[in-house]
Amino acid sequence: YFGKLESKLSVIRNLNDQVLFIDQGNRPLFEDMTDSDCRDNAPRTIFIISMYKDSQPRGMAVTISVKCEKISTLSCENKIISFKEMNPPDNIKDTKSDIIFFQRSVPGHDNKMQFESSSYEGYFLACEKERDLFKLILKKEDELGDRSIMFTVQNED
């Protein structure tokens, strides 16, 4: 069971300082941006991180949403990352959900975050280069100190 608490507006970056945004095709991508680029591309660069109470606490449970014309929420259904047109729900009557991730602070690096899927234990949000695009994917952690699954989260409130 997950119960919604508070939400905050955030900019999410990978460790190469590329900014996460949602493109016109609703794909979550990373791109080099100056601070003014980041502002100019809002709301596509501003993510709503909603925190949830967890009946079996396994970390800070969150959903990640974006509000362009409508609100879309990040999902990892079938281990495929996509934004689904939906509001983060007030309650989720299950112990796992494709839209709930555990936001974890990397020990020794308070400012570095990982997002582990609640549906797929050991799978994390990651940045992966595919041709010329830097995509947000779900990835099984397979090597120690994998930088691709680490992010910084800057609050915009």
């Epitope: 925190m51 079996q56 396994r58 555990f102 020990p107 308070d110």
Partner: antibody, heavy 119, light 110 residues
Framework: EVQLVQSGAEVKKPGSSVKVSCKAS????????ISWVRQAPGQGLEWMGN????????YYAQKFQGRVTITADESTSTAYMELSSLRSEDTAVYYC????????????WGQGTLVTVSS | DIVLTQPPSVSGAPGQRVTISCSGS????????VNWYQQLPGTAPKLLIY???HRPSGVPDRFSGSKSGTSASLAITGLQSEDEADYYC???????????FGGGTKLTVL
């Protein structure tokens, strides 16, 4: 760098209660769990329970259920552990520990508070 | 009521490699992650290894963790005098909510 600073040593009589504080500085307090772990003289570590300040949720080890109360004050970034009906076996060093990665991965520890229960 | 079993003591000469074992069951280590803590004399414990084999920043790569079945182990290579300490394993339940520690192992550097 997060620092956890605990209150000073206590000497208590059997049957009484003790309340130990743990003040966090230099990091986010409310969204992480604060656990309490004790260590009797020359013995190992024993988890007592924890609190997630943002939600107020508390979880207690079965052994301490009904005897321990863990609270948190977000305004002062302080967590508290109160243990009642003290007995001599409760003589131990009590540690608070922060968990930012997972509620049971203790990545930052207080310096410890010695509680002595003696008549 | 110690659920995880560790040897009470291990020893090694400087520069040597030592391992500390931690034995559990399917209800803890067999299905869940293992963490290791180092406690230097007179100080609070310090997180050494988390999630079986991850090192927090600042922990030397001389320390490594592994897990197989219902047992886990901590390996320390290039033993140094400052490694003399008590070492505790801990396992946690991912879906429920409980944690258990081993009884601790005293490492002596000869």
């Amino acid at each position: 760098e997060v620092q956890l600073v605990q209150s000073g040593a206590e000497v208590k009589k059997p049957g009484s209660s003790v309340k130990v504080s743990c003040k966090a500085s230099g990091g986010t307090f409310k969204s992480y769990a604060i656990s309490w772990v004790r260590q009797a003289p020359g013995q190992g570590l024993e988890w007592m329970g924890n609190i997630i300040p943002m939600t107020g949720q508390t979880y207690y080890a079965q052994k301490f259920q009904g005897r321990v109360t863990i609270t948190a004050d977000e305004s002062t970034s302080t967590a508290y552990m109160e243990l009642s009906s003290l007995r001599s076996e409760d003589t131990a060093v009590y540690y608070c520990a922060r968990a930012a990665y997972h509620p049971l991965v203790f990545d930052n520890w207080g310096q410890g508070t010695l509680v002595t229960v003696s008549s | 009521d110690i659920v995880l079993t560790q040897p009470p003591s291990v020893s090694g000469a400087p520069g040597q490699r030592v391992t500390i074992s931690c034995s559990g069951s399917s209800s803890n280590i067999g299905n869940h992650y293992v963490n290791w803590y180092q406690q230097l004399p007179g100080t609070a414990p310090k997180l050494l290894i988390y999630r079986n084999n991850h090192r927090p920043s600042g922990v030397p790569d001389r320390f490594s963790g592994s897990k197989s079945g219902t047992s886990a182990s901590l390996a320390i290579t290039g033993l140094q005098s400052e490694d003399e300490a008590d070492y505790y394993c801990q396992s946690w339940d991912y879906s429920g909510f409980s944690t258990v520690f081993g009884g601790g192992t005293k490492l002596t550097v000869l």
